[in-house]
Interface confidence: low
């Protein structure tokens, strides 16, 4: 079983899923309002968003004193955060600016991918090897959407029997999408295009917030019980609390290289020939060159106009 990395508003913590009764290790302490968290295992980096400081920060997990600011302007409520470990990019949602943005892992070359028809975007999950991204929106018209990680092919995949979709996670091995609904109190799963929807845990969960997966097991944080719970991902069997008495459990991830499988990086050679951003794409050649917001891509599809 994995280590679970979770945000706890005042800190980020790691807890062993098999021994959750023991104290969690504080990875980064003294935080204001840590909400979302993710990591790039191969680089030894942990990222988090702080909704009070309106910032995204990072640390090297072997050097906990080395906190760096990544994005510090133009954020209001960065509720969701996801690292593209393959293309080495950072994606985030902001439920107040109503945007989904992308940047390099250091925060440079920032680009707004989506800014329309977003109300309360929250969880975001990436599948870099297929070039797709997924996010939940718990606004007036709640839904789960999918799009290319380059901003293409946006599509609503779930928009029925959905109210407060909070947690979202992908099963890369079995090509499934799992999500938790805090109002309808369930965890459901579907194919990655939203078809073949099935209940995993029927409406019995008090207030599930964030969701992750490792091998056969789903793990999630619950605001009502102040705990991390788990169950079998196929059957929902064995539902149990594995770590309790958490101050304010927020985002959660299974902290393991297994959750960030290696694959061919289409941007790996010479940044795909792109002058600036090279983003994963679901269509051949499986990458798309892009420019920071406000800068035009020239007709060659590779180079951004001078002044970027």
């Amino acid at each position: 079983a994995p280590l679970l990395l979770y945000a706890n508003r005042r800190d980020l913590r790691l807890v062993d899923a098999t021994n959750g009764k023991e104290n969690a290790t504080i990875v980064v302490g003294g935080l204001e309002d840590a909400a979302a968290v993710d990591f790039v295992f191969s680089h030894g980096l942990i990222y988090w968003s702080d909704v009070s400081e309106e910032a995204i920060k990072r640390t090297e997990f072997n050097k906990t004193e080395s906190v760096q600011n990544v994005v510090v302007s133009g954020l209001l409520s960065p509720d969701g955060l996801a690292c593209d470990w393959l293309g080495e990019k950072l994606y985030w949602t902001d439920s107040e600016t109503n945007r989904i943005e992308v940047s390099n892992l250091d925060g440079s070359l920032r680009k707004v991918l989506f800014w329309q028809e977003l109300d309360q975007p929250r969880a975001i999950a990436l599948d870099p090897s297929s070039g797709f991204m997924y996010w939940t929106d718990w606004g007036e018209v709640p839904k789960i959407e999918r799009a290319g990680m380059d901003g293409s092919s946006r599509f609503i995949i779930i928009n029925s029997e959905i109210y407060w979709p909070n947690g979202l996670t992908l099963d890369y091995e079995e090509q499934k999408l799992y999500w938790a609904d805090a109002k309808l109190n369930f965890i459901h799963k579907s194919n990655l295009d939203g078809t073949n929807r099935q209940a995993v845990v029927k409406g019995s969960l008090p207030h599930p917030f964030a969701l992750t997966l490792f091998e056969d097991i789903l793990y999630w944080t619950d605001w009502s019980t102040h705990s991390i719970l788990a169950c079998n991902k196929y059957t929902g069997e064995g539902l149990r609390e594995i770590h309790s008495d958490i101050f304010s459990p927020m985002d959660i991830h299974a902290f393991s290289q297994q959750r960030q499988p290696n694959a061919t990086n289409p941007c790996g050679i010479d940044n795909g020939g792109c002058s600036h951003l090279c983003l994963m794409s679901p269509v051949k050649p499986f990458y798309q060159c892009a420019c920071p917001t406000g800068v035009k891509l020239l007709e060659n599809g590779k180079t951004c106009k001078d002044g970027a």
Epitope: N19, K21, D216, N232, Y234, R240
Partner: antibody
Framework: EIQLQQSGPELVKPGASVKVSCKAS????????MYWVKQSHGKSLEWIGY????????NYNQKFKGKATLTVDKSSSTAYMHLNSLTSEDSAVYYC??????????????WGQGTTLTVSS | DIVMSQSPSSLAVSVGEKVTMSCKSS????????????LAWYQQKPGQSPKVLIY???TRESGVPDRFTGSGSGTDFTLTISSVKAEDLAVYYC?????????FGGGTKLEI
């Protein structure tokens, strides 16, 4: 080191009852199901049932319903199996075995040393 | 209940020989959602508790020598010992954990 330490051999009379214990150490007791298995002399293995120490939930083989009762004491990380109305058919070695994390159907990765029960007048 | 049948019930071999034993289930143990076979193999040496060798039909438990190999899918499974050692004297059981009640095969007794 993960260990399952079972209580010693029992010699009891027909009609009596017995309680076999299995003390777990070296892992988070409430995170894993505890299974019980019967092995009659020179015979194969039979699954009796399991208990989920986290919530006390049980699942019995229909054949052993009414014969076996499974309980746990979380404070001492000990699982118990109570066998009642004993007959010579109940004479066997009984094993406790650790299963999966209560979250999945699973094989048994650690076994107790076995408790020999002899029912004889 | 799923019935597990093992064959042969016993076999005698010499040290260094290759051994195969069979286990058949009365219904498929392959779970379509994860393409895993819910079958385990155990070794029980005289006077000892069973010890798991193989799970998911073919995954070797850590610490188990690589001369032990599990194979098969669906209803037909095989345990192979590539080169038998004297310490392999034991009874070998297969077990399904696909559905309750979990059931074991009758065992194959390996004599050296």
């Amino acid at each position: 080191e993960i260990q399952l330490q079972q209580s010693g051999p029992e010699l009891v009379k027909p009609g009596a009852s017995v309680k076999v214990s299995c003390k777990a150490s070296g892992y988070a007791f409430t995170s894993y199901n505890m299974y019980w298995v019967k092995q009659s002399h020179g015979k194969s293995l039979e699954w009796i049932g399991y208990i989920d120490p986290y919530n006390g939930g049980t699942n019995y083989n229909q054949k052993f319903k009414g014969k076996a009762t499974l309980t746990v004491d979380k404070s001492s990380s000990t699982a118990y199996m109570h066998l009642n109305s004993l007959t010579s058919e109940d004479s066997a070695v009984y094993y406790c075995a650790r299963g999966g994390m209560g979250l999945r159907r699973d094989y048994f990765d650690f076994w107790g040393q076995g408790t020999t029960l002899t029912v004889s007048s | 209940d799923i019935v597990m049948s093992q064959s042969p019930s016993s076999l005698a071999v010499s040290v260094g020989e290759k051994v195969t034993m069979s286990c058949k289930s009365s219904q498929s143990l392959l779970y379509s959602s994860n393409q895993k076979n819910y079958l385990a193999w155990y070794q029980q040496k005289p006077g000892q508790s069973p010890k798991v060798l193989i799970y998911w039909a073919s995954t070797r438990e850590s610490g188990v020598p690589d001369r032990f190999t599990g194979s098969g899918s669906g209803t037909d499974f095989t345990l192979t010992i590539s080169s038998v050692k004297a310490e392999d004297l034991a009874v070998y059981y297969c077990q399904q954990y696909y559905s309750y009640p979990y059931t074991f095969g009758g065992g194959t007794k390996l004599e050296i």
